[in-house]
């Protein structure tokens, strides 16, 4: 209805004597701002006066004046939206109807709110889920239809009168829709909580008791069982009898079925609370329990381990590991079913008793070839001695033994000979399947264990072989002691240490890396001419003409070896400089003249400088000076200077004559 004022607030608010009420409230007036507000207690409309009668708890007018006795009641709203109220403290006689009389410039409205104030704090209300099962987390809720900013309260949870350890989450609501305080407790009940009392206690800020609510927990759970056995230690011998009894200590709801299990498997036709086993055999040893079910599910008792004792059965031997490698450790395990476990063992190797070995395991820390053979054992317990089983075979594997490399050739061996070697050994398990040789080479193996080296190298100093099965055993290397001509013959400059300049004292050394036999002779040659027979070649004062290609030779009883040709380079400053002219030293004006600075130098000339007849340097750095077009004024004597890293040299003067062209002569 568009002619109504619109209000939003809780319909009824609850409190108790001495507490407070906080009334959240919003409104929308029909027109304009609020000009007058009166809060009535139990208002009644008077038709005669056309006004409301009743106790005025609060009044505000245009001038904004509020009587001093109204401090208990506070209007916390405003002129257009908010109509929130607070009564602090609240009294029993405040119960009833609150009337909010609102007036704007042209409109009036009376809004009614119910207030329920009790003499004492009213109890909270515990809400439980419809069903509670053991170990399943549930949320317990405690709800109180009260909350007020001026009166803090707390909700505490108790189990059988003792505060619960779990943390509760408390929330409050003070909105136009609802006013409440709520505590939620997450809790995983156990079967033992069934029938226990849970309390939600309302307390003031100081923890003082105000009121409470209680509920009894109904925790659904599987049956809880106890198993009893005769004899109590559940240890019997074959032929004895055993009785087991199942007792239900708790079940919610009531149980429906009973069964028995051995090693997790259900026993057929055993559906009573007593299990009788007569004349037991060793196969009946195992773990027994009873299972009782209700609507929640099956419950199981603890397990009883029934042990039926008997003498050891025929034994078997387990070897860790066979085949075994020589030097490794091996463990033998005697396996025989018996109850109680065997207390004594007798061990046999190849049928012969092994002295001092009485344990279930035999450990050999370092296996040798003679440990191979058949191992068997006998087990013994308090009820008797077992039989010896078939035994187990230990295979001991080892690398080839006593490997040697043998040279088949007559000695000495010369470079280029064909050498035959064989690889011998004493024993091996498993058999030798291949051979290896060191160093590796492109060599021939005409048969297993034989090596043929064609054209033996000078540097084949030693050879070793290995005989291999799963492992390789290497023989000690044998020396071939190959004889060869001198090697790596080269010319080495001893002095000077730096580059050779004309006039230097020069010494060349004939070096070689090795020779076998060691006795050697030298000789030097240059361009096929014999120069000397010493290891050194000396020049007191070198000249450019000594430059050239030098070789030295070294020989022994096996042969002779020449060095690579070594170029002797003599460095000298530019010499024999001259200026050549192209096309000639007489050129017609307007043509091109090219002057070339020719020289003999080592290293070659790196920088040229050109000069005219007045010794003025010309701005050219090249070997050629090109004058194009050449002019008559360019006639004159030119010279050049050549520079290298050793020094400088200069040419004599060369004269260029530039003559007039016929055109010029014709013009004169």
């Amino acid at each position: 209805d568009s002619s109504k004022w619109v209000f939003e607030h809780p319909e009824t608010l609850y409190a108790w004597e001495g507490a407070c009420v906080w009334i959240p409230c919003t409104y929308r007036a029909l027109d304009g701002d609020l000009e007058s507000f009166i809060l009535f207690h139990n208002p009644e409309y008077n038709k005669n006066t056309s006004k409301f009668d009743g106790t005025r708890l609060y009044e505000s007018t245009k001038d904004g004046k509020v009587p001093s006795e109204q401090k208990r009641v506070q209007f916390l709203g405003d002129k257009n939206k908010n109509c929130t109220l607070s009564i602090h403290p609240v009294h029993l006689n405040d119960s009833g109807q609150l009337g909010l009389r609102m007036e704007s410039k042209t409109e009036k409205w009376m809004e009614r709110i119910h207030l329920n104030v009790s003499e004492r704090p009213f109890p909270p209300h515990i809400q439980l889920p419809p069903e509670i099962q053991e170990s399943q987390e549930v949320t317990l809720t405690c709800l109180l239809n009260f909350s007020c900013y001026g009166y803090p309260i707390q909700l505490q949870w108790l189990l059988e009168g003792v505060p619960m350890r779990q943390a509760a989450v408390t929330s409050t609501s003070l909105t136009i829709k609802s006013v409440f305080t709520r505590s939620e407790l997450k809790f995983s009940p156990q079967w033992s909580h069934h029938g226990k009392i849970v309390t939600c206690q309302l307390q003031d800020a100081d923890g003082k008791f105000l009121s409470n609510d209680t509920v009894q927990l109904n925790v659904k759970h599987t049956p809880k069982l106890e198993i009893k056995v005769t004899p109590s230690d559940a240890i019997v011998r074959e032929g004895d009898s055993v009785t087991m009894t199942c007792e239900v200590s708790s079940s919610n709801p009531e149980y429906t079925t009973v069964s028995w299990l051995k090693d997790g498997t259900s026993l057929k036709k055993q559906n009573t609370f007593t299990l009788n086993l007569r004349e037991v055999t060793k196969d009946q040893s195992g773990k027994y329990c009873c299972q009782v079910s209700n609507d929640v599910g099956p419950g199981r008792s603890e397990e009883v381990f029934l042990q039926v004792q008997y003498a050891p059965e025929p034994s078997t031997v387990q070897i860790l590991h066979s085949p075994a490698v020589e030097g490794s450790q091996v463990e033998f395990l005697c396996m025989s079913l018996a109850n109680p476990l065997p207390t004594n063992y007798t061990w046999y190797h190849n049928g012969k008793e092994m002295q001092g070995r009485t344990e279930e395991k035999v450990h050999i820390p370092k296996i040798l070839p003679w440990h191979a053979g058949t191992y068997s054992c006998v087990a013994e317990n308090i009820l008797g001695t077992g039989q010896r089983g078939p035994g187990a075979e230990l295979d001991v594997q080892y690398p080839p033994k006593k490997v040697t490399t043998v040279i088949q050739n007559p000695m000495p061996i010369r470079e280029g000979d064909t050498v035959t070697l064989s690889c011998n050994y004493n024993s091996s398990n498993p058999s030798v399947t291949r051979y290896e040789w060191k160093p590796h080479g492109a060599w021939e193996e005409p048969s297993l264990g034989v090596l043929k080296i064609q054209n033996v190298g000078w540097d084949n100093t030693t050879i070793a072989c290995a005989a291999c099965n799963s492992w390789c055993s290497w023989a000690s290397p044998v020396a071939l002691n190959v004889q060869y001509a001198p090697r790596d013959v080269r010319v080495r400059k001893i002095k000077p240490l730096s580059e050779i300049h004309s006039g230097n004292s020069v010494s060349l050394q004939c070096d070689f890396s090795s020779s076998h036999p060691k006795e050697v002779q030298f000789f030097w040659e240059k361009n096929g001419r014999l120069l000397g027979k010493e290891s050194q070649l000396n020049f007191d004062s070198i000249s450019p003409e000594d430059a050239g290609s030098y070789s030295c030779w070294v020989n022994n009883s096996i042969g002779q070896t020449a060095s690579k040709a070594w170029t002797l380079e003599v460095l000298y400053a530019p010499r024999r400089l001259r200026v050549s002219m192209s096309p000639g030293d007489q050129v017609m004006e307007g043509k091109s003249a090219t002057l070339t600075c020719e020289s003999d130098a080592n290293p070659p000339v790196s920088h040229y400088t050109w000069f005219d007849w007045n010794n003025q340097s010309l701005p050219y750095h090249s070997q050629k000076l090109r004058l194009e077009p050449v002019k008559v004024q360019h006639s004159g004597a030119y010279w050049c200077q050549g520079t290298n890293s050793v020094g400088k040299g200069r040419s004599p003067l060369s004269t260029l004559t530039v003559y007039y062209s016929p055109e010029t002569i014709g013009r004169r």
Partner: antibody, heavy 127, light 111 residues
Framework: EVQLQQSGPGLVKPSQTLSLTCAIS??????????WNWIRQSPSRGLEWLGR?????????DYASSVRGRVSINVDTSKNQYSLQLNAVTPEDTGVYYC?????????????????WGQGTMVTVSS | QSALTQPASASGSPGQSVTISCTGT?????????VSWYQQHPGKAPKLMIY???NRPSGVSNRFSGSKSGNTASLTISGLQAEDEADYYC???????????FGTGTQLTVL
């Protein structure tokens, strides 16, 4: 301080002659440690050395092979200036033309670099 | 006579170093120690920065240095500054009748 001041027209018709002058201040065109050069720059050819003139006991000049036969460099010692003449120009000769000094003596040793440049003249060859 | 080869562009951040290469032949860069380097800002004439491979004219910052190995010369600018952004050209004396040859030019950008 050595300065080079260039002058000459900015527009030349094809087949005509391009003439530019470079006035020297702070040095002499007769110096026997310098050469006097012309260099041009265009987007298509980059920087290009065209030629030089210099005086030792007499006057010498050198030209780049790309313009040899249609270029000459002349000197006016009285005005301390030198000039470039480039005949039979084509649009290919369009670019910025610079005069530059090459000081060839650095103390007692040889040197070679263009250490002073003119301000440059933009020349367009177009009809 | 073909031009000396330079990278078309190079760049670096302020404070960093940058090196520009200039490759020729044994008839020019490799044959003579007369390599020079020039800086050119837009619309301006080239300015000599390095002469005779590694010498600096007076007034040029010591952040600029030059070197040569075989047929390749290099210009290194250390501690880059915004004002170093320009085109850089190398030049060499040559044994051909065209006595001087220039590089193709490198545009340096300071990031």
């Amino acid at each position: 301080e050595v300065q080079l001041q260039q002058s000459g027209p900015g527009l030349v018709k094809p087949s005509q002659t391009l003439s530019l002058t470079c006035a020297i201040s702070g040095d002499s065109v007769l110096s026997n440690s310098d050469t006097w050069n012309w260099i041009r720059q265009s987007p298509s050819r980059g920087l290009e050395w065209l030629g030089r003139t210099y005086h030792r006991s007499t006057w010498y000049d050198d030209y780049a092979s790309s313009v040899r036969g249609r270029v000459s460099i002349n000197v006016d010692t009285s005005k301390n200036q030198y000039s470039l003449q480039l005949n039979a120009v084509t649009p290919e000769d369009t670019g910025v033309y610079y005069c530059a000094r090459d000081r060839l003596q650095d103390g007692n040793s040889w040197s070679d670099a263009f250490d002073v440049w003119g301000q440059g003249t933009m020349v367009t060859v177009s009809s | 006579q073909s031009a000396l080869t330079q990278p078309a562009s190079a760049s670096g951040s302020p404070g960093q170093s940058v090196t520009i290469s200039c490759t020729g032949t044994s008839s020019d860069v490799g044959g003579y120690n007369y390599v020079s380097w020039y800086q050119q800002h837009p619309g301006k004439a080239p300015k000599l920065m390095i002469y005779d491979v590694s010498n600096r004219p007076s007034g040029v910052s010591n952040r600029f240095s030059g070197s040569k190995s075989g047929n390749t010369a290099s210009l290194t600018i250390s501690g880059l500054q915004a004002e170093d952004e320009a085109d850089y050209y190398c030049s060499s004396y040559t044994s051909s009748s065209t006595l001087y040859v220039f590089g193709t030019g490198t545009q340096l950008t300071v990031l």
